[in-house]
Interface confidence: medium
């Protein structure tokens, strides 16, 4: 079985999660991509997706989520701004490739959002203190409704990778237990 790994991001309310999902350039550059939340024992729920076909470097905003697909680099950039405690949960990027099932991109992202002052700008390497101005050209894309039953969460054995400064605020771990996540607003 494929080893499902995850990266853990611990952020404060009001901060921004800013991550990338990399994909095979030749196969998936223009494919529609999505950001999903995974709830315990349920099929992943799509929260935002790029247009179809996906446009290069064209921001798509759905609520507090911004997706940008960099075709030249094989990267999907995902930002979740103004984080709330309820955003805590397990997330993943997928590539839609109908009629086949969505292709999951590793790693999954374990987001833990806690209450409290977010600190001075730059104090957390994984956050931005709400400085992002949402580009005026953002568009909202319609996402396919189907999800893959194969991506229902299962927990592989625990294993922890080392992290050293300046990455000390990020803990890379394998999936252990999947917490129940409140509905994403």
């Amino acid at each position: 079985a494929t080893k499902l790994t995850e990266e853990k991001y611990e952020l404060k309310e009001g901060q921004t999660l800013d991550v990338k999902c990399d994909y095979t350039l030749e196969k998936f550059a223009s494919s529609q991509k999505a950001w999903q939340i995974i709830r315990d024992g349920e099929m992943p729920k799509t929260l935002a997706c790029t247009e179809r076909p996906s446009k290069n470097s064209h921001p798509v905003q759905v609520g507090r989520i911004i997706l940008e697909d960099y075709h030249d680099h094989g990267l999907l950039r995902v930002r979740m701004v103004n984080l709330q405690v309820e955003d805590s949960g397990l997330y993943q990027c997928v590539i839609y490739q109908p009629p086949k099932e969505p292709h999951m991109l590793f790693d999954r992202i374990r987001l833990v959002v806690t209450k409290g002052f977010s600190g001075t700008p730059g104090s957390n390497e994984n956050s931005t203190q709400n400085v992002y101005k949402i580009p005026p050209t953002t568009t909202k894309a319609l996402c396919p409704l189907y999800t893959s039953p194969r991506t229902v969460t299962q927990a592989p054995p625990k294993s922890t990778a080392d992290v050293s400064t300046p990455d000390s605020e990020i803990n890379l771990t394998n999936v252990t237990d999947i917490i129940r996540v409140p509905v994403f607003n």
Epitope: D18, K20, V78, T128, Y132, L172
Partner: antibody, heavy 122, light 108 residues
Amino acid sequence: QVQLVQSGAEVKKPGASVKVSCKASGYTFTSYGIHWVRQAPGQGLEWMGWISAYNGNTNYAQKLQGRVTMTTDTSTSTAYMELRSLRSDDTAVYYCARGRPSSSWGNWFDPWGQGTTVTVSS
Amino acid sequence: EIVLTQSPGTLSLSPGERATLSCRASQSVSSSFLAWYQQKPGQAPRLLIYGASSRATGIPDRFSGSGSGTDFTLTISRLEPEDFAVYYCQQAVSLPWTFGGGTKVEIK
């Protein structure tokens, strides 16, 4: 101690290829990306691209697309950078550097290899 | 691509003095994705500051970073003899990652 050790200096003729190696130690190789940065004599730093040691995905600077190939050998924790069709303006010190963990957007580099001098001359 | 312009090109100071180095971006850069490096002759660069203001491991507290948006500053509160080197800023918010042209801090 996290360390990157690069291969030795190379002298090449225009049109040839060069392959520089970068052996990592002191950390879990597959948890981080390896970036390549070059510095022409007396000049500043130029980011060339990076490879994810986790899944082998590569991202290259636009100006080097088609001439550069970055690879890794996870069994030996070694990254490689091959540059083809060498020109005189490729003469530079080539550095490998460790990036941040695989999913973080944005990258800065720590630590760096000691550098490999590549001289392209006829 | 984001262009980073560093000034001054050369800074001539004496040990014990305060050094203020500037890095200006052609467009807004989140402070979370701005770094500073030090490079001495014949050596590889060394990470000093990441996230605009966080010191990397082992970097003395005389080095500090600040700024947001398009203007960032590296300050060395009291120059030590080993601080005379070239300093580069780097942005990591927009591909391709780019470096500034560098500021050389030399002994006056």
